[in-house]
């Protein structure tokens, strides 16, 4: 489907507003660092080539590809190599190693200031003043801070944070209508990041059979009634737009996921009976609201899967023959079968299954061989619904806070050289798979919980392969996609380890934490039992439980003191040396 | 001592036929898949065939129709039909890893027998 | 078609050295079925790595693979006398059908 110009013709099906914002955020997920008004320059001079190439597709550069056209616009930054360093040198590249370039330097972690939300009616102000740059801002600050968030996806949630804006900045109470609103938009994206994280890094780091391998097991769920052939399909066309995505092609990757809704609208009667009221929506929630759609029903009386996989006598022949149709078809049956079970289980008993008929098709007696291959995954589908079962009896007795950091002391033990914001950070997102998961019944545990901790693991990859400090680390993320988390959760406390040298000044406190919110708070408190951790490997559970009740109640003496500074000061030195007692420091 | 050990080659004439041997002692071949692999002269490997222990069968592309690989209980043969000048190559047998069934992983080779095609 | 690349297609070196081949499949091999074979002139192939990346027993540590996917490479960290030869990879891919060689690199003598 060759045009004779990809930017008009993106430019058309998009409409300018889509293109427009679709750039912004390409340019922000390349160029972290540059400020806005810079941003919002560039785009304007792409979109007016664009609208040029739009009325004559014949006229100059306008046969350029999409990759040559951005990121010549991108190297004509002039503070290119003061701001990235070694990033300008991608200019000296030419296509395509000077995106792959570009795709390189995307920092998963830029050193960029946190978002401090102002006061509502400087927010409702801004708005109305000027909404669309309003928009565009937050486009820009979202899509920089997230340098790989799903970008048709952050047009869904611009429409939500201008829908919530127009509404509540008219409200009686502003603040109570917008803040929760504002709160929510938050998560939501935090999550559709990680999300999309892991996604990219499976198709970059693990290849496209891989997250082909992952989009089979999870439509196959989903979509339970569709053909195997229907769901190879929307596999195929889900693996272009999210390697399009993934790969800075946002307008290509827009506009296909567009296609593919409308496909999926106008075949639904093969594909899923829950779909109905997703196909009426408008396109941005469309897209959303099919990509969340819950698993259809099971059909009824599906044969077992023993005759197809196990006793016909042409199972090692459609091996040899076609893996990927063959092992396509077994993740296909099992997943649809098995809605109760997460992806990553799934694609670990594909991949048993595969192994055992790799080793016994060439024997003399293959079926006698692979006979008992069944057999083979029962182990492997116990391990996780055991720790399951074990972490959500824990969550419930702890609750969430104390969850989180009985998952900081498990993790800091097992990797401690990995930096304590790091740690923090990944361990209270694993600690939130207990509020998220543990309430759901039996059979919707196991898909909820393994497959989210796959992306919180993913945040720690990512972050980790940054700045590699542990090749425990390196060997989890790396080895195998869907063992990272039976990997992480075999991990013993490491004994090479070298115990942190104790530092009074990680340990003092001040005033300050009084004004913090209680998430902050919560924070700082776990950032010192990091610390404490590292400093004392072998401490117990019940020693550092002493020691945070210790801190707790200093901290919550020192807020009520009349001077809070003097008791931060004098209470602390006092506690440091009773914890240093305790653990033997 | 494990050995393979091929024969059977030598000059043919074009649209000719020739059958090579692979004989497999110090093992049970009952237990082993054997492939056919070729290399002309001064050119790359080429793959020509697997048989599994147990007589299934599978080609390249490119083999199938010309060339039948079969085995007895201590003999694999390769039966080449409607030979051209461009077969002409010193061919291998050689032993998969116990273990795979259709991963490129030959540890055991025959010392290679030379067909020669040509008028 | 399936196509498999090695480069370069010889190298001279000296002893000591650290030599590099590199092989291309496109499209990717399945699930890490790649092998690198030596041959010297006038014998067999031997296998010196399979899965990409395992060593053959008694093949020496000098011998590395590494790659996944469509890009392979093998390394001889300081290249012996015995190591000139030619080196093959071999992929096996989703069909059997289309296992597949490299067309070999001549590691010479410099």
């Known amino acids: 489907d060759a045009h004779k110009s990809e930017v008009a013709h993106r430019f058309k099906d998009l409409g300018e507003e889509n293109f427009k914002a679709l750039v912004l955020i390409a340019f922000a997920q390349y160029l972290q660092q540059c400020p806005f008004e810079d941003h919002v320059k560039l785009v304007n001079e792409v979109t007016e080539f664009a609208k040029t190439c739009v009325a004559d597709e014949s006229a100059e550069n306008c046969d350029k590809s999409l990759h040559t056209l951005f990121g010549d616009k991108l190297c004509t930054v002039a503070t290119l190599r003061e701001t990235y360093g070694e990033m300008a040198d991608c200019c000296a590249k030419q296509e395509p190693e000077r995106n792959e370039c570009f795709l390189q330097h995307k920092d998963d972690n830029p050193n960029l200031p946190r978002l401090v939300r102002p006061e509502v009616d400087v927010m409702c102000t801004a708005f109305h003043d000027n909404e669309e740059t309003f928009l565009k801002k937050y486009l820009y600050e979202i899509a920089r801070r997230h340098p790989y968030f799903y970008a048709p996806e952050l047009l869904f949630f611009a429409k939500r944070y201008k829908a919530a804006f127009t509404e509540c900045c008219q409200a009686a109470d502003k603040a109570a209508c917008l803040l929760p609103k504002l709160d929510e938009l938050r998560d939501e994206g935090k999550a559709s990041s990680a999300k999309q994280r892991l996604k990219c890094a499976s198709l970059q780091k693990f290849g496209e059979r891989a997250f082909k391998a992952w989009a089979v097991a999870r439509l196959s769920q989903r979509f339970p009634k569709a053909e195997f052939a229907e769901v190879s399909k929307l596999v195929t066309d889900l693996t272009k737009v999210h390697t399009e995505c993934c790969h800075g092609d946002l307008l290509e990757c827009a506009d296909d996921r567009a296609d593919l809704a409308k496909y999926i609208c106008e075949n639904q009667d093969s594909i899923s009976s829950k779909l109905k009221e997703c196909c009426e929506k408008p396109l941005l929630e469309k897209s959303h609201c099919i990509a969340e759609v819950e698993n259809d029903e099971m059909p009824a009386d599906l044969p077992s899967l023993a005759a197809d996989f196990v006793e016909s006598k042409d199972v090692c022949k459609n091996y040899a023959e076609a893996k990927d149709v063959f092992l396509g078809m077994f993740l296909y049956e099992y997943a649809r079968r098995h809605p109760d079970y997460s992806v990553v289980l799934l694609l670990r008993l594909a991949k048993t299954y595969e192994t055992t008929l790799e080793k016994c098709c060439a024997a003399a007696d293959p079926h006698e061989c692979y006979a008992k291959v069944f057999d083979e995954f029962k182990p492997l589908v116990e391990e996780p619904q055991n720790l399951i079962k074990q972490n959500c009896e824990l969550f419930e007795q702890l609750g969430e806070y104390k969850f989180q950091n009985a998952l900081l002391v498990r993790y800091t033990k097992k990797v401690p050289q990995v930096s304590t914001p790091t740690l923090v950070e990944v361990s209270r997102n694993l600690g939130k798979v207990g509020s998220k998961c543990c309430k759901h019944p039996e059979a919707k545990r196991m898909p909820c919980a393994e497959d989210y901790l796959s992306v919180v693991l993913n945040q720690l990859c990512v972050l980790h392969e940054k700045t590699p400090v542990s090749d425990r680390v390196t060997k989890c993320c790396t080895e195998s996609l869907v063992n990272r988390r039976p990997c992480f959760s075999a991990l013993e406390v490491d004994e090479t380890y070298v115990p942190k040298e104790f530092n009074a000044e990680t340990f003092t406190f001040h005033a300050d934490i009084c004004t913090l919110s209680e998430k902050e708070r919560q924070i700082k408190k776990q950032t010192a039992l990091v610390e404490l951790v590292k400093h004392k490997p072998k401490a117990t559970k019940e020693q550092l439980k002493a020691v945070m009740d210790d801190f707790a109640a200093f901290v919550e003496k020192c807020c009520k003191a009349d001077d809070k500074e003097t008791c931060f000061a004098e209470e602390g030195k006092k506690l440091v040396a009773a914890s240093q007692a305790a653990l033997g420091l | 001592e494990v050995q393979l050990l091929e024969s059977g080659g030598g000059l043919v004439q074009p649209g000719g036929s020739l059958r090579l041997s692979c004989a497999v002692s110090?093992?049970?071949?009952?237990?082993?898949?054997i492939n056919w692999v070729r290399q002309a002269p001064g050119k790359c490997l080429e793959w020509i065939g697997i048989?599994?222990?147990?007589?299934t069968t599978f080609y390249a592309t490119w083999a199938k129709g010309r060339f039948t690989i079969s085995r007895d209980s201590t003999t694999v043969y390769l039966q080449m039909n409607c030979l051209r000048a461009e077969d002409t190559a010193v061919y291998y047998c050689?032993?998969?890893?116990?273990?795979?069934?259709?991963?490129?992983?030959?540890?055991?080779w025959g010392q290679g027998t030379l067909v020669t095609v040509s008028s | 078609d399936i196509v498999m690349t090695q480069s370069p297609s010889s190298v001279s070196a000296s002893v000591g050295d650290r030599v590099t081949i590199t092989c291309q499949s496109s499209?990717?091999?399945?699930?890490?079925?790649l092998s690198w074979y030596q041959q010297k002139p006038g014998k067999a192939p031997k296998l010196l790595i399979y899965?990409?990346?395992k060593l053959t027993s008694g093949v020496p540590s000098r011998f590395k693979g590494s790659g996944s996917g469509t890009d392979f490479t093998l390394t001889i960290s300081s290249l012996q006398p015995e190591d000139f030869a030619t080196y093959y990879c071999g992929g096996g891919y989703s069909s059997i059908s289309d296992t597949t060689f490299g067309c070999g690199t001549k590691v010479e003598i410099k």
């Open positions: 499209p990717s091999v399945w699930s890490n079925f």
């Open positions: 050689a032993r998969t890893v116990p273990g795979y069934s259709t991963a490129p992983y030959f540890d055991l």
């Open positions: 110090g093992i049970d071949l009952s237990n082993y898949a």
């Open positions: 899965e990409a990346s």
């Open positions: 048989i599994w222990a147990s007589g």
